[in-house]
Interface confidence: medium
C-alpha cells in the first residue's frame, strides 16, 4: 500500500514539473505510474530500453542519486549520467575558452609572420646597401647577410643561438672581404690564406670601432624582447589548451550528475538546478583550475608591461630595419682608418712585403634614401605597435577568465533564475539555501566529497610554466628612463660604465633585459660574453649586460622552442537539450 502511494506521489511530481516555471495549474488526470518520460529522455543518451526500469524501483543500489522513495533510475543509468555530465562539463569549458583561445592563436600567428616579414625587409635593405655602395663585396656580403638574418629568424623562434656570436660572425666574415676587395683590391690570390688572420685582426684591432658592440646591444635587446613576446603568446595558448582539455574527477562527475540529472530519477524533467547550488558545485569542480587565476592575471599584466616597453632599442622593427645604416657606418669607419689599419695588418698578417698597400675610394652616401626608409618604417612600426596594444587590451578583458569560470559555466548552463523553484541536488525547493542543502544531505554524498586535493598534475605543470614565463617577462621589463632617454647611438657606450677594463658589467648600457629583478643571475647560463679591456689585443667588445656572464641566473635566455600550434577545431556540443 505504501509503495502505491509513493508511486502516485512520483507521478504527481512528474506532472507538476511540466508547469515550471509558469503558474501552478490543476493537475491533469494521473497517467500510468511508469517511468515513460525518464525512459524517452534517457534513450537520447543511450539507445535501448534495458537500463531504465519500467516502473519506479527502490533504487537501493544507487550511489549518487540516493532516492527518498521509488526512483526511475538504475545503477547503469547513473553511470551513464556521470559520464555525460563530465563530457558536458568539458564541452562547456571549451566553449568558455574558445574566444580567448582564438584571440591568442590568431595573434601569435600574426606576430610571428610580421616579425618574419621585418627580418626579410631588413635583409633586403642590407643587401641593397651593399649592392649600391659596395658592389665588389656583393656576392660574399649577400651570403653573410643571409646567414645572419637566418640566424635572427631562428633566434626569434627559440633556437639556441648566441646573438653576440651572430654579430661577431657577420663582422668576422665581412672584414676579410672588405680588406681584400676594398682596401687592397689588387691583393694576389696567394694572399687569400690571410683570411683567418684577418678574422682575428678584426676583433684584436677593433677595425669596425664600437659598431659591432652597438649592434650587439641593439640586436640582442630587441630580439630577446621579441622572442619572449612570442614565447609568452605560445605559452598562453598552451595554458588554454591545458585547461581546455582537463578531465574532471569522478568526484566532480558525481556532483555534476546530482546537479544536472538526479532530478530526472524523480521524474522532475523540467526542473533546473539552483544558481547558488551550481556555483558551489562549479567552484568545487574547478578548484584546481581557479588556482591558475593569480598567475594568469600576472601573465597578462607582465605581458602588458613588456609590450609597453617594446620601442626604440627594444623594438626589433626599429633595430633591424635600421641595421643596414649601422653596418654602412661601420664600413665607413674602416675606410677612414684604412691607412693605419693596412700598415698594422700588413705586419700582423705578414704580407707587408708582398705589395704596396693602398686604400681605395669609397662612396660615402647611401643610394637608399634613409628618409623614405624611415617614414615607411615608422608606419610599419606603428601598425605592429598598435596591434600589440590592441591585443593587450583584448587580453585584459580576459584577466579574470579563470576566477570567473565557475560563474560563466553556470550562466551558460540551465539554472533557475533567482534561485526559486529549483533543484538543490536532493529535492525541489522554493528557494536555495546552501546551509539547508548541506543539512539535508548530512548522510549523503555531498559537497564535502570534493576534498581539496590540490590542482591536477597538468594544472600544476602549467602553473609552473606560467610562473616561469612571468619571471621572464619581469626580467624583460625595460628600463624606465635612464637608457630610453639617451640617443640610440649612445646605447652601450656610457662612459665609465662598462668599457674600462676586462671585467664584465651588469648594467653599463642601462638596466639590461636579461636582468631578473631581485633574482640571482649567477654563472648558471653564460649565454653571452663580454671582453672589456683598454689594451688592444683583446676580443671585440660585446654588449655590456646583455652578454655578460654573471653571478646571477640569466633567465632571459631560457630557450623553450616555440610549439607548433595545434589546429583549433573545437566542436562545442550543445547539451542543453539533455538537461533542459
Amino acid at each position: 500500500m505504501a509503495g502505491t502511494v509513493r508511486t502516485a506521489c512520483l507521478v504527481v511530481a512528474m506532472l507538476l514539473s511540466l508547469d515550471f516555471p509558469g503558474q501552478a495549474q490543476p493537475p491533469p488526470p494521473p497517467p500510468d505510474a511508469t517511468c515513460h518520460q525518464v525512459r524517452s529522455f534517457f534513450q537520447r543518451l543511450q539507445p535501448g530500453l534495458k537500463w531504465v526500469p519500467e516502473t519506479p524501483v527502490p533504487g537501493s543500489d544507487l550511489q549518487v542519486c540516493l532516492p527518498k522513495g521509488p526512483t526511475c533510475c538504475s545503477r547503469k543509468m547513473e553511470e551513464k549520467y556521470q559520464l555525460t555530465a563530465r563530457l558536458n562539463m568539458e564541452q562547456l569549458l571549451q566553449s568558455a575558452s574558445m574566444e580567448l583561445k582564438f584571440l591568442i592563436i590568431q595573434n601569435a600567428a600574426v606576430f610571428q609572420e610580421a616579425f618574419e616579414i621585418v627580418v626579410r625587409h631588413a635583409k633586403n635593405y642590407t643587401n641593397a646597401m651593399f649592392k649600391n655602395n659596395y658592389p665588389s663585396l656583393t656576392p660574399q656580403a649577400f651570403e653573410f647577410v643571409g646567414e645572419f638574418f637566418t640566424d635572427v629568424s631562428l633566434y626569434i623562434l627559440g633556437s639556441d643561438i648566441n646573438v653576440d656570436d651572430m654579430v661577431n660572425e657577420l663582422f668576422d666574415s665581412l672584414f676579410p672581404v672588405i680588406y681584400t676587395q676594398l682596401m687592397n683590391p689588387g691583393l694576389p690570390d696567394s694572399a687569400l690564406d690571410i683570411n683567418e688572420c684577418l678574422r682575428g685582426a678584426r676583433r684584436d684591432l677593433k677595425v669596425f670601432g664600437n659598431f659591432p658592440k652597438l649592434i650587439m646591444t641593439q640586436v640582442s635587446k630587441s630580439l630577446q624582447v621579441t622572442r619572449i613576446f612570442l614565447q609568452a603568446l605560445n605559452l598562453g595558448i598552451e595554458v588554454i589548451n591545458t585547461t581546455d582539455h582537463l578531465k574532471f574527477s569522478k568526484d566532480c562527475g558525481r556532483m555534476l550528475t546530482r546537479m544536472w540529472y538526479c532530478s530526472y530519477c524523480q521524474g522532475l524533467m523540467m526542473v533546473k538546478p539552483c544558481g547558488g547550488y551550481c556555483n558551489v558545485v562549479m567552484q568545487g569542480c574547478m578548484a584546481g583550475v581557479v588556482e591558475i587565476d593569480k598567475y594568469w592575471r600576472e601573465y597578462i599584466l607582465s605581458l602588458e608591461e613588456l609590450v609597453n616597453g617594446m620601442y626604440r632599442i627594444y623594438d626589433m622593427e626599429n633595430v633591424l630595419l635600421g641595421l643596414f645604416s649601422t653596418i654602412h657606418d661601420s664600413i665607413q669607419y674602416v675606410q677612414k682608418n684604412a691607412g693605419k689599419l693596412t700598415t698594422t695588418i700588413g705586419k700582423l698578417c705578414a704580407h707587408s712585403q708582398q705589395r704596396q698597400y693602398r686604400s681605395a675610394y669609397y662612396p660615402e652616401d647611401l643610394f637608399i634614401d634613409k628618409k623614405v626608409l624611415k617614414v615607411a618604417h615608422v608606419e610599419h612600426e606603428e601598425t605592429l605597435s598598435s596591434r600589440r596594444r590592441e591585443l593587450i587590451q583584448k587580453l585584459k578583458s580576459f584577466i579574470s577568465f579563470y576566477s570567473a569560470l565557475p560563474g560563466y559555466i553556470c550562466s551558460h548552463s540551465p539554472v533557475a533564475e533567482n534561485d526559486t523553484l529549483c533543484w538543490n541536488g536532493q529535492e525541489l525547493v522554493e528557494r536555495y539555501s546552501q546551509k539547508a542543502a548541506r543539512n539535508g544531505m548530512k548522510n549523503q554524498f555531498n559537497l564535502h566529497e570534493l576534498k581539496m586535493k590540490g590542482p591536477e598534475p597538468v594544472v600544476s605543470q602549467i602553473i609552473d610554466k606560467l610562473k616561469h614565463i612571468n619571471q621572464l617577462l619581469r626580467t624583460m621589463s625595460m628600463p624606465k628612463g635612464r637608457v630610453l632617454d639617451k640617443n640610440l647611438d649612445e646605447e652601450g657606450f656610457e662612459s665609465g660604465d662598462c668599457g674600462d677594463d676586462e671585467d664584465e658589467c651588469i648594467g653599463g648600457s642601462g638596466d639590461g633585459m636579461i636582468k631578473v629583478k631581485n633574482q640571482l643571475r649567477f654563472l648558471a647560463e653564460l649565454a653571452y660574453d663580454l671582453d672589456v679591456d683598454d689594451a688592444p689585443g683583446n676580443s671585440q667588445q660585446a654588449t655590456p649586460k646583455d652578454n655578460e656572464i654573471s653571478t646571477f641566473h640569466n633567465l632571459g635566455n631560457v630557450h623553450s622552442p616555440l610549439k607548433l600550434l595545434t589546429s583549433m577545431a573545437i566542436s562545442v556540443v550543445c547539451f542543453f537539450f539533455l538537461v533542459h
Epitope: 656570436d165 676586462e502 671585467d503 651588469i506 648594467g507 654563472l523 656572464i549
Partner: antibody
Framework: QVQLVQSGAEVKKPGASVKVSCKAS????????MHWVRQAPGQGLEWMGA????????AYSQKFQGRVTLTADKSISTAYMELSRLRSDDTVVYYC????????WGQGTLVTVSS | DVVMTQSPLSLPVTLGQPASISCRSS???????????LHWYQQRPGQSPRLLIY???QRPSGVPDRFSGSGSGTDFTLKISRVEAEDVGVYYC?????????FGSGTKLEIK
C-alpha cells in the same frame, strides 16, 4: 681609475658578528657585481658570495649560507659583508673584488677572532 | 663544485729563466659560447691578488707581455718567459664559469 677601499682590521670575540665595508670609486658602482673572497694566512682563496648592487640580489657559497649577509648602499657606492657567529677559523683576510674576472681587489681586511 | 688543481706547489726559478705553472679543472671550463672562463692571479707577499690573465689567454693592460696563458678545456698553463725578481709570490688559477667560482691552491714562485 677603479679603486676598492676596505675598512680597517677588526678584532672580534667568538660568536660575535663583523661587518666589513668596501667603498668603490672610479666606475659606476651599480654596473658590476661585487664579490667577496677570503684568505686564511698562508692559504688559498675562497669565494664567499656575490652581490648585485643594482637590485640587491645576492648569491652565497653554501659553506657560508646563513652566516654571511651582503648588502650595498648605492648612494655612497659601498658594499658590505657581514659575517655572524664568528669562530676562531674565521680569522682570515676578507677581500672585496669586482666580478667577473676579479681584475680589481680591495686591499683586504684582517678579521681576528679571539677570546 | 669545480676543483682546480695546481702544480707544482712550489717553483724555484733562476732569474731570467722561463717558468711554467699548470692548472687542471675537474670539468671543462669551455662554455658553449666558446669562451674559457679561466683566470690567473699573482699575489705578492702582503698584497692583494692581481689579475694576470683572464679567459685563458687574455692579458689585461699593465701586465707585462712575459706573462702568457694557454690551454683549453680542463688543462691550462701560465708561462713566464723570463722570470724577474718582482715576479716572486703565489700564483693562483681560478674559474668563474661555473657556480661557485673556485681557485687553485696556489703555486709559490721563488728565486733560486
Amino acid at each position: 681609475q677603479v679603486q676598492l677601499v676596505q675598512s680597517g682590521a677588526e678584532v672580534k670575540k667568538p660568536g660575535a658578528s663583523v661587518k666589513v665595508s668596501c667603498k668603490a670609486s672610479g666606475y659606476d658602482f651599480t654596473a658590476y657585481e661585487m664579490h667577496w673572497v677570503r684568505q686564511a694566512p698562508g692559504q688559498g682563496l675562497e669565494w664567499m658570495g656575490a652581490l648585485d648592487p643594482k637590485s640587491g640580489s645576492t648569491a652565497y657559497s653554501q659553506k657560508f649560507q646563513g652566516r654571511v649577509t651582503l648588502t650595498a648602499d648605492k648612494s655612497i657606492s659601498t658594499a658590505y659583508m657581514e659575517l655572524s657567529r664568528l669562530r676562531s677559523d674565521d680569522t682570515v683576510v676578507y677581500y672585496c673584488t669586482r666580478f667577473y674576472s676579479y681584475a680589481h681587489w680591495g686591499q683586504g681586511t684582517l678579521v681576528t677572532v679571539s677570546s | 663544485d669545480v676543483v682546480m688543481t695546481q702544480s707544482p706547489l712550489s717553483l724555484p726559478v733562476t732569474l731570467g729563466q722561463p717558468a711554467s705553472i699548470s692548472c687542471r679543472s675537474s670539468q671543462s671550463l669551455v662554455h658553449s659560447n666558446g669562451y674559457t672562463y679561466l683566470h690567473w692571479y699573482q699575489q705578492r707577499p702582503g698584497q692583494s691578488p692581481r689579475l694576470l690573465i683572464y679567459k685563458g689567454s687574455q692579458r689585461p693592460s699593465g701586465v707585462p707581455d712575459r706573462f702568457s696563458g694557454s690551454g683549453s678545456g680542463t688543462d691550462f698553463t701560465l708561462k713566464i718567459s723570463r722570470v724577474e725578481a718582482e715576479d716572486v709570490g703565489v700564483y693562483y688559477c681560478g674559474q668563474s664559469g661555473l657556480t661557485p667560482p673556485t681557485f687553485g691552491s696556489g703555486t709559490k714562485l721563488e728565486i733560486k
